[in-house]
Amino acid sequence: MNGRVDYLVTEEEINLTRGPSGLGFNIVGGTDQQYVSNDSGIYVSRIKENGAAALDGRLQEGDKILSVNGQDLKNLLHQDAVDLFRNAGYAVSLRVQHRLQVQNGPIGHRGEGDPSGIPIFMVLVPVFALTMVAAWAFMRYRQQL
């Protein structure tokens, strides 16, 4: 049986204060720019170094932002979402959905096409090589006795 990759979804309220360089992140998504198929939600695409978000540390690239200051981000055009963030004021409250990758099933048997799974030959080849080296060393040792 192949293992599968599931996601543990958690939500968090993150309160940020705009720094000298702003909140410090970029977004993707919107009804006119779907980032995830069948999902027009707004996602964090990049967190800028030394920005408020980076210094706070909780917001991560790939997080989905559900609301800004209590205002839902569903069914917004991309530019409207950008404008909403830019006009959100000094203190900004973000409702964020984190997706943490969790693996079910036997280790080393992730679902096909999952790039984070380790192919079995990548484990077997080094093990085989080590076995051969050990056997060769053992034979050399025995010959010297």
């Epitope: 705009r18 909140l23 992140f25 970029n26 950008v82």
Partner: nanobody, 120 residues
Framework: DVQLVESGGELVQAGGSLRLSCEAS????????VGWFRQAPGKDREFVGS????????TVVNSVMGRFTIFRDNPKKTVYLQMTSLKVEDTAVYYC??????????????WGQGTQVTVS
Amino acid sequence: DVQLVESGGELVQAGGSLRLSCEASTGTFGDYDVGWFRQAPGKDREFVGSINWSGDRRTVVNSVMGRFTIFRDNPKKTVYLQMTSLKVEDTAVYYCAARFRSSVDWQYDYWGQGTQVTVS
């Protein structure tokens, strides 16, 4: 990173016209909003106007409205500030600045070195 180079600044008589250019180093310049700013001697840098990534949103401050316009040519990776009916008080170093269009902030991340405009 995006490098910006302004050009076109010179000495001009009051009532004259100038076109400033802001050329970018990146091939994805069409993904950036661009703002023009100016700094007169002994004064703070002030916002003049901006244009969004696609060119369909443009704004200029009241003091230059009707005299200055901003437009862009994305294939040429260039944004222009067209200045007409120039006044002595328009004398300043003019800067262009860029920010990624999907940034959640108003602040501009990339700045040029500026070009001097002197109106006599």
